[in-house]
Interface confidence: medium
Amino acid sequence: THLGIRLPLRSGLAGPPLGLRLPRETDEESEEPGRRGSFVEMVDNLRGKSGQGYYVEMTVGSPPQTLNILVDTGSSNFAVGAAPHPFLHRYYQRQLSSTYRDLRKGVYVPYTQGKWEGELGTDLVSIPHGPNVTVRANIAAITESDKFFINGSNWEGILGLAYAEIARPDDSLEPFFDSLVKQTHIPNIFSLQLCGAGFPLNQTEALASVGGSMIIGGIDHSLYTGRLWYTPIRREWYYEVIIVRVEINGQDLKMDCKEYNYDKSIVDSGTTNLRLPKKVFEAAVKSIKAASSTEKFPDGFWLGEQLVCWQAGTTPWNIFPVISLYLMGEVTNQSFRITILPQQYLRPVEDVATSQDDCYKFAVSQSSTGTVMGAVIMEGFYVVFDRARKRIGFAVSACHVHDEFRTAAVEGPFVTADMEDCGYNIPQTDESTLMTGRA
């Protein structure tokens, strides 16, 4: 998939917990796979610009060619620009690599907004600020694209970290992370800490506006506070999870939980917004509007067209509610909730007409492809993609933006019955649709 617009307190949470609150589990986590503790060399290895995705530096070929690569948990191809393009400062030059092998096979990936196509091959790949290994991986050399690369984004390729089932042209093309785990002793786990900017950025500041960490092979405990809570990966294609309840400032949306996962719910670092199915979006906006009714905003704001602006430094965060998503827990009938603040779902942007004010875009939007927990959600949390144990962990990020009154939260356990019923079963047809247009 591809970006659209398409990228340390009291909790202040209102409302009763869902059902019976269970006694708090011990803070001792069950043993994690892989190395634990400190991954100093990988901390702060992500860069990016608000709304344009987070990228990591990678090297490809022999001698190594350095490229910035978008980290995307919503797709499964490792694809890099391999021909001149007006938006690329550099690109992969296969003819200069002595280790490049042509697979004599093309790949074509259409998106709602654009496409890329290229030629498949393999080459040696490493991550300078990652594990000290080099692996031979599949690479799609992008020779032609339309509305894929973003002007000024500073990345030249995409690292799809999801599963082979959604790889193009088909699931026989092994994704990069599978190759990495197979060819090394690196545990089958990675974790992401995406750190949003939290304030509007002018052209100069935007050059190095957001950062974060991709920890390959384990968990770095310095990147989160509190404990990690895990939700099962429902199916290994996208990183699909199940949402069992949604609250706005503690008020339950009271929808059939199947609606929250219609037709799936995924965790996707390559999407900017929190995207919700139409019915859920409408209910959520109605509830957020009601909760923030001390100020009236134009309809165009809620629909993503207009910005809201306040005099610099006067954004009234307190009038906006928190959004809580309850995720299926690892234990039967147990769930936990992740709570984001307006500091996550109001995305700072520069008004094209004036730069005096602090302006924001409503970063919750409508989806026709299910719930997408994009950067808006991920910027509040340290997210662990524990592939080995088929689960995704959430903990409060040490770098999330908050104020003196509220902080993002991960809390549990809560008793929730019949959570399996919340998953939507997609009719068995050829699953060839690409999730796209990722605002």
Partner: antibody, heavy 120, light 108 residues
């Protein structure tokens, strides 16, 4: 500089449909809204609806609900407005216009207009 | 829907004089209002947005004021190229984003 270029004039029979296109060039397409506004001869401006390509579904004025369909093709940066069950009072110049990226949803860039004549 | 009412329907002014156009909303739209100018055979052109901010390239003789339900467009010294029809549009609710009926500024 963003430009919106519309398709040419159309003459249609009552009861038929017309589809007008609006191609954007020179700027971002998908994250802005494209509105359609019509103007009957000697009359004022009438807002028909709009679409934010990246968010999908269009919004329509009640008056046109069920008769108008606004779509966008992001791959070609083109928006479309289709009006069905045409009647003589639909004779008008149809404009597309862009908004977005600011606190206000003002229509800052307009197409040149497409004259649609409905006549038997 | 919000109804926008413009007055007068026609304003006859001599070149060099001041023109004051009025726009009233049936309910408060805050400062979410724009003014457009349209000349015969041309597409409308944005003049003012946010009730009082001039669009890029619009001369200083055009100014907008007001908020809530009452708005005014003032042209301080009419030039020959300013004779046109002027429309206000509320940018607060949609659908629909309603326009006023227009004020025609003609040469006296």
């Amino acid at each position: 500089q963003v430009q919106l270029v519309q398709s040419g004039a159309e003459v249609k029979k009552p009861g038929s449909s017309v589809k007008v296109s609006c191609k954007a060039s020179g700027g971002t397409f998908s994250s802005y809204a494209i509105s359609w506004v019509r103007q009957a001869p000697g009359q004022g401006l009438e807002w028909m609806g709009n679409i934010i390509p990246i968010f999908g579904p269009a919004n329509y004025a009640q008056k046109f609900q069920g008769r108008v369909t606004i779509t966008a093709d992001e791959s070609t940066s083109t928006a479309y407005m289709e009006l069905s069950s045409l009647r003589s009072e639909d004779t008008a110049v149809y404009y597309c216009a862009r908004s977005g990226g600011t606190k206000y949803g003002m229509l800052d860039v307009w197409g040149q207009g497409t004259m649609v004549t409905v006549s038997s | 829907e919000i109804v926008m009412t413009q007055s007068p329907a026609t304003l006859s002014v001599s070149p060099g004089e001041r023109a004051t156009l009025s726009c009233r909303a049936s309910q408060s739209v805050g400062s979410n209002l724009a003014w457009y100018q349209q000349k015969p055979g041309q597409a409308p052109r944005l003049l003012i947005y946010g009730a009082s901010t001039r669009a890029t390239g619009i001369p200083a003789r055009f100014s907008g004021s007001g908020s809530g339900t009452e708005f005014t467009l003032t042209i301080s010294s009419l030039q020959s190229e300013d004779f046109a029809v002027y429309y206000c549009q509320q940018l607060y609710t949609w659908p629909p984003r309603t326009f006023g009926g227009g004020t025609k500024v003609e040469i006296k």
